[in-house]
Interface confidence: low
């Protein structure tokens, strides 16, 4: 449901899928549930700092402490995961730094980084002491429920001993777990008594049971895996951009829009225009003209460049960014001065591209 009318004579090529949109990912801070997390806002000369999470203002509460340039989250839960931003407001400008918080039980790679050579798990028994299987490290088995974001790697461990050395097999939902049951299969590291699944998907959800047995007995332990699909959010635009600008008649000017979006964003540059001497259509909505959008023929849609401007180019320029979740827009004003008047920038913006898409 668009909230504007497009000028009828605006010539736009048919909507094309946006070009591959390059962004540098914000820094990611990882914490396990229950841990405390402290993040320092990496902005210099910050007089006043405000914080947001997923684009919504973040205030202090019984678990969130905001002290100076520090954000502390006590007893983190998966609901604390998301895109955070701190904005430093100064007298002349403002600057925003984005970072991700990921509160998850999942290990971050397919390697057994918490294992050494596995010697502490692989117990050698004296051949005379026959013994049924037993767990050698129950601490590594305490957490039965694993909620893991999609695409992460999961490792389940059942360190055991016995004589003769027990064998280990894995069941999924009570049935034999075969390699062909999942795309990419899985790894079993017998020396580490572990099952590893890389790049989990929702169909990996279920109960995983290790069965450890020898001729004297059998023991088993069940883990529950829940695969959480990532919830994208609507685009977030860097505060203060695009910035107001002024130039003389015949001069050139650039507006810049910095976007963070974890779903494919579509950028439009829009300007209010007049039609038949009116700024508004019969429905009361303003006439808008799309000057540029991130279609296949657009280069660097984040930047709108205007060359050889005239007085008619003065006015409000809107950067509108949408993805399939929602949209965001911010605007700036262009002032066009007579040639004899020297232009002065209304805002001094020092925006680093390092932390934004």
């Amino acid at each position: 449901r668009p909230s504007f009318s497009l000028v009828e004579d605006t010539t736009l090529e048919p909507e094309e899928p946006p070009t591959k949109y390059q962004i540098s990912q914000p820094e990611v801070y990882v914490a396990a549930p229950g841990e405390s997390l402290e993040v320092r806002c990496l902005l210099k000369d910050a007089a006043v700092i405000s914080w947001t999470k997923d684009g919504v203002h973040l205030g202090p509460n019984n678990r969130t402490v905001l002290i100076g340039e520090y954000l502390q989250i006590k007893g983190a839960t998966p609901r604390d995961s998301g895109l955070y931003a701190c904005t430093a407001s100064r007298t002349v400008d403002s600057e925003t730094w984005y970072f991700m918080v990921n509160v998850t039980d999942a290990i971050s790679s397919g390697d057994d980084e918490d294992d050494t050579d596995g010697a502490e798990d692989f117990v050698s028994e004296n051949s005379n002491n026959k013994r049924a299987p037993y767990w050698t490290n129950t601490e590594k088995m305490e957490k039965r429920l694993h909620a893991v974001p999609a695409a992460n790697t999961v490792k389940f461990r059942c360190p055991a001993g016995g004589n003769p050395m027990p064998t280990m097999r894995w069941l999924k939902n009570g049935k034999e777990f075969k390699q062909e049951h999942r795309i990419g299969g899985y790894k079993v590291r017998n020396q580490h008594w572990s099952l590893i699944m890389e790049s989990v998907v929702p169909s990996d959800k279920g109960n995983y049971t290790c069965v450890v047995e020898n001729e004297y007995g059998s023991i088993n332990h069940t883990y529950h895996l829940d695969v959480v699909e990532r919830s994208p959010h609507r685009p977030i635009l860097q505060a203060g951009l695009p910035a107001n600008a002024s130039t003389v008649v015949g001069g050139d000017v650039e507006f810049v829009c910095k976007v963070y979006s974890d779903a494919q964003p579509h950028i439009q540059w829009i300007k209010h225009v007049e039609k038949n001497g009116s700024k508004y259509g019969p429905d009361g909505l303003p006439y808008l003209k799309v000057l540029k959008h991130s279609g296949i023929n657009s280069s660097n849609a984040e930047v709108l460049a205007l060359f050889n401007v005239t007085e008619a180019d003065a006015g409000e320029y809107i950067c509108k960014v949408s993805n399939y979740i929602g949209q965001a827009n911010q605007s700036a004003w262009l002032t066009v001065l007579p040639k004899q008047q020297a232009p002065g920038r209304e805002k001094e913006i020092t925006a680093s591209p390092d932390y934004l898409e």
Epitope: E229, P232, H233, Q327
Partner: antibody, heavy 122, light 107 residues
């Protein structure tokens, strides 16, 4: 224009089955979770079931768990609700709505179908 | 499960009045709360998302606010077209729960 059109409702006897459909148009169906909501005559709204983009994960209200199955066919942009062992308390208008578990999305439940009426009676 | 207690169950007000409807959550749900309007014989319509954000096309006389576990929908300058039943919905986790509804009538 975003449109959701439900069908498949009707009069059915207790213990029997019924399958509802919801055809979506005007948006990228496989980019959204989808949800069924129902409303008994003269009563309030009740969440019934939700399904993820791919259909791999499904979620159900306790009152329908084990009797009702939500599914989707992304190629046909269609959402389904298979209702088995129907009871009189399942009598309601069933609405489908597009969903986004992301929380603050303005598109979350912003589009609803016109509803399809299910009456369970002998 | 988290309970949503909506009040009042019905409300009668004059045109031009300011009315407020409240939902109380039994546990913390953050800002994961929405408000819907349903007119007789019609499908529900999203009015407020994220506890405080106005949905597309909703008149600015509608607003949402939060104070702790209490969430409010306020209508300023009541108009005849606002006569409807209003529901809150919490959606921080499954199962999603609607409030019982508030029937708003015009005196």
């Amino acid at each position: 224009e975003v449109q959701l059109v439900e069908s498949g409702g009707g009069l059915v006897q207790p213990g029997r089955s019924l399958k509802l459909s919801c055809v979506a148009s005007g948006f990228r169906f496989n980019d959204f979770w989808m949800t069924w909501i129902r409303q008994a005559p003269g009563k309030g709204l009740e969440w019934v079931a939700s399904i993820t983009y791919t259909g791999d994960n499904t979620y159900y209200a306790g009152s329908v768990k084990g009797r009702i199955t939500i599914s989707r066919d992304n190629a046909k942009s269609t959402l389904y609700l298979q209702m088995n062992s129907l009871r009189s308390e399942d009598t309601a208008t069933y609405y489908c709505t597009r969903d986004d578990y992301g929380g603050y999305s303005p598109y979350y439940m912003d589009a609803w179908g016109q509803g399809t009426s299910v009456t369970v009676s002998s | 499960d988290i309970q949503m207690t909506q009040s009042p169950s019905s409300l009668s007000a004059f045109l031009g009045d300011r009315v407020t409807i409240t939902c109380r959550a039994s546990q913390d749900i953050g800002n994961y709360l929405r408000w819907f309007q349903q007119k007789p014989g019609k499908s529900p319509r999203l009015m407020i998302y994220g506890a405080t954000n106005l949905a597309n096309g909703v008149p600015s006389r509608f607003s949402g606010s939060r104070s702790g576990s209490d969430y409010s929908l306020t209508i300023n300058n009541l108009e005849s077209e606002d006569m409807a039943i209003y529901y809150c919905l919490k959606h921080n986790e499954y199962p999603f729960t609607f409030g019982s509804g508030t029937k708003l009538e015009i005196k």
